[in-house]
Each structure stands twice: as structure tokens, then as C-alpha cells.
Interface confidence: low
Amino acid sequence: HQDKVPCKMVDKKVSCQVLGLLQVPSVLPPDTETLDLSGNQLRSILASPLGFYTALRHLDLSTNEISFLQPGAFQALTHLEHLSLAHNRLAMATALSAGGLGPLPRVTSLDLSGNSLYSGLLERLLGEAPSLHTLSLAENSLTRLTRHTFRDMPALEQLDLHSNVLMDIEDGAFEGLPRLTHLNLSRNSLTCISDFSLQQLRVLDLSCNSIEAFQTASQPQAEFQLTWLDLRENKLLHFPDLAALPRLIYLNLSNNLIRLPTGPPQDSKGIHAPSEGWSALPLSAPSGNASGRPLSQLLNLDLSYNEIELIPDSFLEHLTSLCFLNLSRNCLRTFEARRLGSLPCLMLLDLSHNALETLELGARALGSLRTLLLQGNALRDLPPYTFANLASLQRLNLQGNRVSPCGGPDEPGPSGCVAFSGITSLRSLSLVDNEIELLRAGAFLHTPLTELDLSSNPGLEVATGALGGLEASLEVLALQGNGLMVLQVDLPCFICLKRLNLAENRLSHLPAWTQAVSLEVLDLRNNSFSLLPGSAMGGLETSLRRLYLQGNPLSCCGNGWLAAQLHQGRVDVDATQDLICRFSSQEEVSLSHVRPEDCEKGGLKNINL
């Protein structure tokens, strides 16, 4: 009579997900090892029939309406290793009437998230769990943790407490968890970490609290193992004192209120002068710290969305392993990395959306930098070789600045221009919205760009040969919104070009693509095209996938190539229903509705169709 149970059974795994069940089925194979009953309407868990399935190792009871656990309900499940009771109603009194979950001798992972559990009640629910490695209490209503909260679980390694309302963690709350390595306390209501002393902890997530200060315990010989610390979305006013955490690899401090000090520390003894924010800086290590160089192993530092106005030299000095530094959305007016060997491993530097006016990058600094994001600043008169000095630079975003590109080596630009030629590593460059008036010949010579965006520079004049040297490398070119009437670019020579954006100009002619090229997407929206003759477009037929044409004064006749694309569909032309064309009488119709005979009236024979 097993066929009466609508569960799916494969080997020793049984899935009864979302079947509207009101109770645990009693007719499943007794040797079932994995049982998924999630998403049903179970209200109580009784020792019978659950106790029949003594071979169970995995039991998922999540997303039900469980408010009653019969004492000893799990007692017979002596092999049980993974138990999920997430998203039920265990906070209701009947769930805890006698002994809660009871002992769980072999359970290694237990999920009690989303049960509205509150402090005090939790202690009654948790029983002895000597093998427990992973415990989730996320999305509950816990307000405090005491010494008694986590007793009898000596093997616990991972503890998830995110999305509670924790305001208070009693001293010694985690003392009974000697193996704890991962602790998630994000999305709580903590205001201060004044005595962090969990030496064995490796990962600590404190994001989305209201923390104003983070201080490690003052144990001179302490060897903290912490490698990953997330403090984003808090209320830190200063860079925390992390000198006791020499193994930190990942540090996220974004979305705080951090300012870095602008002068030397008032207190010459070291790192404790809170008035100036120097408690904030990892300038010297405590005497007992073996490495002697705090943050020397840090790979990833996120300081975005803070209130930093200046980066002191001493701050960058110790970050010798740093690969990723995010300083976007701060108040920086200047950034300097001039010293030989400054940030030697840095691969990505995000300085976007600050108020940068000056940028000084030394000839041998930032030797590993691949990505530099500078969009949304006020950069204007930069030293000409600012970017040419960056030996590994591959991607550069300068959108929304006021940078003027120099010409090629034989075509020097005006004072204050920046050289973009001869940067042999550079692949992607955005100069969108820089008020560039003239793009000089040879501007990108010996810089094998694959992507170049010059959009939103109204009035831009592209000199003959301005894109010279890019013919064999360029794959994406955008010249949108520049008011161009003619294009001084021999497009068919760009043999690798896949995407071309010429929208929002005043173009009426394109060069003839007579031989097959690589172009896949062509955006000609809002220009002045009336004809796209087959003689010019023929070479695109094999490669072109999408063509954007709305907002052009297209002629209904003489556009046979375009009509053929609409009907045969080799090229996906946008909005085919609404692509409007005009007859000489100024009558407007949908181009897809034009018939050959419409163009023969009055001698308007459509020779291309």
C-alpha cells in the first residue's frame, strides 16, 4: 500500500515536499535514510510513526506548522545526523512542555531558524548534542545570550544567529564552545564589541548591527585566528584597532561613518588617541604579536560608503598583501600612491564616486593593478602619464570626470591632457561624459583596447585616425549621444568589432561593409538615417544579430535590405511592429507593412526588393 503515499522514493531517499500532509506518513520503507517533509502542514511530531524509521540520517521538517514535539520524539532515531526544524512554530509553549528536543547524540547539524524563539526559552529547547558541528538559530527573536545558552555542545564549529534582536552577549557566552570557528551575528542590535576574545574563531560576521566600537581583548600573548571579519552597515566612527588580528584576510567596513585621521597622532605612545581617530589605525602591533605587522596578510578591504576625506601614507604602508581595495562613495579629494612598492599586490582599486580632483600614482607603485575605477569624480588636469605608469592596468573607468585625452606620440595634446597611447596592457576604457571636445589622431596608438566607450560627450569631434591602432583589437565601441553628423572612422577596418553603439547622434550615412565582418549588435537609434542600402549593409548579414533603428526618419522605399531583414528575420530588428517609415508624401506607416507595389507608384520603384 505504499502507492497510496504520494512521496517520491529513490534508493533510501524519500521526498514528501509540499504535499499538504498533516502528519508523518506511516507507510514509508523502514530503511529510509533521508526523509524530506518540508513545506507541509505538520503540527505535531509524535514518537510514532517517526520512531519506525530508525535508519534515518537526514530529516527535514522545515516550513511546517510544528508547535508540539512529543517528549522523546527523536529518541529512537539513533543514527540521525542532520535535523531541520526551520520555519515552524516551536516558540509556542506546547513545543517545550517536557524536555524540548531531548538528547541528539549523533546529530551534526541542526537548523532551528525562523521559529520566533526568544531568550530563556531556547535553553529549554536545546538538549545534549555532543556531536553538533553546525547550529542555525537565525531569524528568531533572541535578545541576549548567556553562559547557559550553549551548554552541552562541545563540538560546535559553526553558529548562525543572524536576524535576531541580540542586544547583549554575556561574558563567557561562547566559553563552552572551544571549537567554534564560524560565527554569524549579522542583522542584530549589537552596539559595541568591547572585549573580543574568541581566539579560535576564523569567520565573524557582525554586519548590519549598530556597532560603534570594536575592540579586541587586551591579552598580550593572544594568538587570534580570525581571517574574515564583516562589519559593514554599522556605526563605526573610526577604523577599528585590529593590531591583535594578524591573520585577517578579508575585512569589510563599508557603510559606516569612518573618517581617517588627517594629522599625526596626539599620543606618541602608539595607537590610542581616540580624539583624533588614531585608535582607528593599525599603525603598530602589540608587543606579543609574532608578525609585528598588523593587516600585512589582508587581501580584501572594503571601506566604501564612509566619510573618509584623506588616506594617510602610513595607512597604506602595511597593506603589502592587499589585492582588492574599495574606497568608493567617500569624500576623497586626492589620492596618492607614489612610494616605490606601495600596494604591490593590489589588483583592483575602486575610487569611484568621491570628489577626487588630483591623483598621483608613482612610476613604480601599484605594479599589479589591473582594474582602476574612477567614475563619478572631478578629475581634470592630471599628469600626462598617470595611467601609462601602471604596468598591469587592464580596465579603466573614468566616466563622469573632465579628462582630456592627448593625441598620439607625434600629435601632442594641450597641457593637462592625459596619455592613453602606449598602455599595452589596457583592454577596457570608459571616457563617458568627460566633456571631451576633440579626440586627436593616435589617441590610442599601441593600446590594444577591446572595449572603448566615448558616449555622452556632446559636440565631440573625432579626428581622422583618432581610433588608429585599434583595428585589430576593438570588440565594443560606444559613441552614443555625441551629436556626431559624420563618422571619421573607417568602421569596416575594425575586423573584431562585435558591438557598435552609435545611438543619439545625427548620422545619416554608414560606411559600406562590403566584406564579412564580426559585428553582432548595431545600435543606430535616434539618428538621421533614411536609407540603409544593401550595398552598404551586405557584409553584415552573416554576423549581425540585432539592429536598433527606432527614432530614424526611415524611407519606406529604397530600404529593401531592411525590409528583407524584417520578413526573413536573419537580423533581429527591434520593435518591428512600430518601425515607422515615411513615403515622400510624409505619410507614415509601419515598414513591415510596405509592399513592393507601394513603391512603384509614381516611379518609386524599390530596386532593392
Epitope: S456, P458, A503, E504, N527, D574
Partner: antibody
Framework: QVQLRESGPGLVQPSQTLSLTCTVS????????VSWVRQPPEKGLEWIAT???????YYNSALKSRLSISRDTSKSQVFLKMSTLQTEDTAMYFC??????????????WGQGASVTVSS | DIQMTQSPASLSGSLGETVTIQCQAS??????LAWYQQKPGKSPQLLIY???SLQDGVPSRFSGGGSGTHYSLKISSMQTEDEGVYFC?????????FGSGTKLEIK
């Protein structure tokens, strides 16, 4: 910072013409498209029209015969005229900036809306 | 015109819960989908563009996904301030079209 502000009459007689103005600051109309979108009481959003950064115009085909969108770049203003108003044109009218380059039209900043009631 | 079908029309979720809203386009929109949130008496706010890119300043509990004609908005660990109406919009081509909206309430 980027802002858009709609202004208009509030109350319009049936069969009359509605004139709305969207005044923008923090960006240039020659760099970004601007759209008009409306929302009748307790209903969803309906796109009305867009004027592109190059001055091109796009209209909702169901309303096109009654619409006109224009702009004055020197005053940073976009105008919408809608003729022959009926009671079903009662709605909150928003103007919004369209962001980004590429092939997607996304409204990243919206005005607070102008309430328009069509009633005699 | 591209039709956008949004579901469900209304949805209630508990604090901390994960909720998902679906949006289906009548044709392939090549990830040209945006999601907006609107609170009573306020204008819509952009949450997600390009199907999965988070707009600056939007909390990371919001995420978007999908391709072709099927897209979704997921809110993990729902907060009180997430109550409101959510709209999808295709931004591939004119006429721009919106989904009918999903009203999200706290249980």
C-alpha cells in the same frame, strides 16, 4: 544631486488639454532621456512618452494621437501635453530619468509626481 | 508590444522570511528587466536593472535573476520597510511596459 520635479494644474475639465512640466537638476537633458509615466488611483504604472537625450520622441501608441512631448534644454525642462482629457486620465503623473547606455531603458530617478484630476 | 505578466498580485510574508515575485515577458527581452519598489504615496524606486544588477544604495537582501522570458525578484530576510508594491518593467524596447504589480505585506 539628481532631482526631477513635476508641476501642473491639478484639476482639469473634461475635453480640455493637460500641460505638465518636469524641471530637472543635477544632470543635463542632452545626456539622458526623460520619460513620463502615470498611475491611476490604486492601479499600476503606465508609460506615456519619452524624449531622448538627442531630442527623439517615443509615445505610447494607445495615447499617441493626444500626446506631445518636448523640452527646453536651456531651462532643463521637459513638457508633456495631453489633449481631450477624460475622467480615466485621472492619475498621478511622474517624470523619470532613463539611465545608462546600451540596450536597456531603465528609470533610475523619479520625481515626486503631480496629481491630476479630470472632473467638471 | 511586449506584455509583462507579474505574479502573484499580492503576497504576505513574515519578518525574516524569503519571498519571491515572478515576472514573465511575452517574448525574449535579453535580460532587459528592471524591478521597482513603491511605497504608499511615494514615487517608485529602482531596485534592480539588467535583470540582476543591484542599484546603488539598495540593500543586498534584494536580488534579481532570470533570462529569456522568465525573471524573478527575491527578498531574503524580509524587513518591515520592504512593505509596498513591486513592479517589473521591460526596458529592451519602446513602448516600455510594466507588470501589473505585486503588493507585499507583512504578516
Amino acid at each position: 544631486q539628481v532631482q526631477l520635479r513635476e508641476s501642473g494644474p491639478g484639476l482639469v475639465q473634461p475635453s480640455q488639454t493637460l500641460s505638465l512640466t518636469c524641471t530637472v537638476s543635477g544632470f543635463s537633458l542632452t545626456s539622458f532621456h526623460v520619460s513620463w509615466v502615470r498611475q491611476p488611483p490604486e492601479k499600476g504604472l503606465e508609460w506615456i512618452a519619452t524624449i531622448s537625450s538627442g531630442g527623439g520622441t517615443y509615445y505610447n501608441s494607445a495615447l499617441k494621437s493626444r500626446l506631445s512631448i518636448s523640452r527646453d534644454t536651456s531651462k532643463s525642462q521637459v513638457f508633456l501635453k495631453m489633449s481631450t482629457l477624460q475622467t480615466e486620465d485621472t492619475a498621478m503623473y511622474f517624470c523619470a530619468r532613463i539611465s545608462g547606455w546600451g540596450h536597456y531603458y531603465v528609470m533610475d530617478v523619479w520625481g515626486q509626481g503631480a496629481s491630476v484630476t479630470v472632473s467638471s | 508590444d511586449i506584455q509583462m505578466t507579474q505574479s502573484p498580485a499580492s503576497l504576505s510574508g513574515s519578518l525574516g522570511e524569503t519571498v519571491t515575485i515572478q515576472c514573465q515577458a511575452s517574448e525574449d527581452i535579453y535580460s532587459g528587466l528592471a524591478w521597482y519598489q513603491q511605497k504608499p504615496g511615494k514615487s517608485p524606486q529602482l531596485l534592480i536593472y539588467g535583470a540582476g544588477s543591484l542599484q546603488d544604495g539598495v540593500p543586498s537582501r534584494f536580488s534579481g535573476g532570470g533570462s529569456g522570458t522568465h525573471y524573478s525578484l527575491k527578498i531574503s530576510s524580509m524587513q518591515t520597510e520592504d512593505e509596498g508594491v513591486y513592479f517589473c518593467q521591460q526596458g529592451l524596447k519602446f513602448p516600455l511596459t510594466f507588470g501589473s504589480g505585486t503588493k507585499l505585506e507583512i504578516k
